[in-house]
């Protein structure tokens, strides 16, 4: 799998989409996991509803939400109030039994807020009670890593 880069602005919401073949993955729940190192496991962050017929219902874990259009074949993950520590490598997965197929490998990059030099009084800061439904979603900038680019930079 190539790795697709999604860029979002710190403090805003980032939407990651993972298209898939709806027939091939029919009846399968999906998950979003965070890659722990190049060879490490992918740690589950959030998964779709435990009844596949209700996969379109938004499920969330902390600031991350997931919803699945099983007929259209698009898994959507929303990272709300994006923070620098959210940057990293992730996977969209299709689950079957104890196995998981990778739908897409994702690199999330967090950009500095271009407004952060302004006086805090000029900034609108979303409240803790803001729901995912109300969250403003920045159109994410995405691209695939170029051939030769290293997904995991070598550690010194």
């Amino acid at each position: 799998h190539n790795t697709t880069v999604f860029q979002g602005v710190e403090g805003q919401s980032l939407q990651v989409s993972c298209p898939y073949d709806s027939m091939k993955h029919w009846g399968r729940r999906k998950a979003w996991c965070r890659q722990l190192g190049e060879k490490g496991p992918c740690q589950r962050v959030v998964s779709t509803h435990n009844l596949w017929l209700l996969s379109f219902l938004r499920r969330r874990n902390g600031s991350t939400a997931i919803t699945d259009d099983t007929l259209g074949g698009t898994l959507t993950i929303t990272l709300r109030n994006l923070q620098p520590h959210d940057a990293g490598f992730y996977q969209c997965q299709s689950l079957h039994g104890s196995e998981a197929d990778t739908l897409r490998k994702v690199l999330v990059e967090v950009l500095a807020d271009p407004l952060d030099h302004r006086d805090a009084g000029d900034l609108w800061v979303p409240g803790e009670s803001e729901s995912f439904e109300d969250a403003h979603v920045e159109h994410s900038i995405s691209r695939s890593l170029l051939e030769g680019e290293i997904p995991f930079p070598p550690t010194s």
Partner: antibody
Amino acid sequence: EVQLVESGGGLVQPGRSLRLSCTASGFTFDDHAMSWFRQAPGKGLEWVGFIGSKAYGGTTEYTASVKGRFTISRDGSKSIAYLQMNSLKTEDTAVYYCARGKRYSYTYWTPAFDVWGQGTMVTVSS
Amino acid sequence: DIQMTQSPSSLSASVGDRVTITCQASQDITNYLNWYQQKPGKAPKLLIYDASNLETGVPSRFSGSGSGTDFTFTISSLQPEDIATYYCQQYDSYLTFGGGTKVEIK
């Protein structure tokens, strides 16, 4: 008039099978998920399982206690949903209801059930 | 599985009284909750869906509120025809019902 009518209930011995039917009228049957519920005498409501609308190709989901024993199916040409119950146990004794899932759009529905049948009694006893 | 704790299990109130029933989920269920009314010998009837939306044709004296783990169902002015058992139902994880609240007239 939108309505659901269940049939097929009765007295059956443990280990035997029974098939319940739910006949729909007054609405486009293929557009809705259909669910089965049950209520043991003097007890609360329990979800048994449901089947997706035609768009979902007859995909089914079940509660753990009936998985592998009960099968839900649907016949769009007759507007009937079925509950095939095999290997029945005494604890399956209940009034069985079929119900229609509330529809938002082609893709989306909510498991709020806005039309219910009158129920049919199933007694499992030797 | 998510447990739904409904309280009280029964209550007696006078016609015109405000009646409140609560439902508590064992974990956060967002707003994935419905309320039903069941009269003796009859099938359940959907009153409220998605925690706070009034089903078409249901009198406005019925209302629902809440999100997360705590939900409330209210009858603003109890009527004789409201004698029934009321159930909450969650669908955040599988589908489960509360134990029911039997409402009687004093």
